[in-house]
Amino acid sequence: PTSSWNISSELNKDSYLTLDEPMNNITTSLGQTAELHCKVSGNPPPTIRWFKNDAPVVQEPRRLSFRSTIYGSRLRIRNLDTTDTGYFQCVATNGKEVVSSTGVLF
């Protein structure tokens, strides 16, 4: 599922925010590494936040992390466990608009 909505009715003509590709769903095996990609572009450069099951993702040293990429953001989970199952959502904002995309990890 993907959604987009305006925060401000007076958008700068130069500003934009685009979800370039819906987030990937992933089915994988225990102990493997999974990567979820949030592909967005915008001006000003968007801030991206990650959520799992409607809650901010909790980073775990050496196991679960997210970082900015040239295309947006990447969430990586190493040593996958059954406890990781759920809905993952990235939310991006450029301060005026918001876009989001959701993927499932099973």
């Epitope: 799992k52 059954t82 406890t83 959701t102």
Partner: antibody
Framework: EVQLVESGGGLVQPGGSLRLSCAAS????????IHWVRQAPGKGLEWVAT????????SYADSVKGRFTISADTSKNTAYLQMNSLRAEDTAVYYC????????????WGQGTLVTVSS | DIQMTQSPSSLSASVGDRVTITCRAS??????VAWYQQKPGKAPKLLIY???SLYSGVPSRFSGSRSGTDFTLTISSLQPEDFATYYC?????????FGQGTKVEIK
Amino acid sequence: EVQLVESGGGLVQPGGSLRLSCAASGFTFSSYFIHWVRQAPGKGLEWVATIHSYFDGTSYADSVKGRFTISADTSKNTAYLQMNSLRAEDTAVYYCARTRPTGGAFDYWGQGTLVTVSS
Amino acid sequence: DIQMTQSPSSLSASVGDRVTITCRASQSVSSAVAWYQQKPGKAPKLLIYSASSLYSGVPSRFSGSRSGTDFTLTISSLQPEDFATYYCQQAYWSPATFGQGTKVEIK
């Protein structure tokens, strides 16, 4: 309108089998996690099993692993719980429930079906 | 599995009272906690999700909050229809796990 309707409960002897059904309507069945949650008489809620039919993925509570099987028929928008080797401690009301579109909470529940395991 | 320790197990209150129920998670569950209301012979009903978001159609006298791994359900002014059992649930880690329940009875 979203609806979940369970059926198939009843009285069964220890060691016996039963199959519960959860008929869903009002939403795209294959896009959601569907769960079975049970409640023993006078007790709290216990998660039993989960399926996401799009991925054909399942998970189980340790207490039922190897005895219960969750499945789904997307053509019928129905989830099933096949319960084998039933024990007295499996006696409970069994509810099916759906997860919210972005996960987490169970937003819709069925009315429940009672399973009694007794000789 | 994550343990959700709910307290109290029961409480007596009067119509109009402010009621608070708490749940403590055994480890971080972010803000992925939901609260349910259940009446005898009925299925649970979702009240709060994501620790503090009010579910559609739920009266505004219900509210939820989070402080670290402690979660609170508050009923600001208890109504006759609120006498029921309440459960918390963590949904961050699979499997979902529930608190033991709090029965709210008439004083």
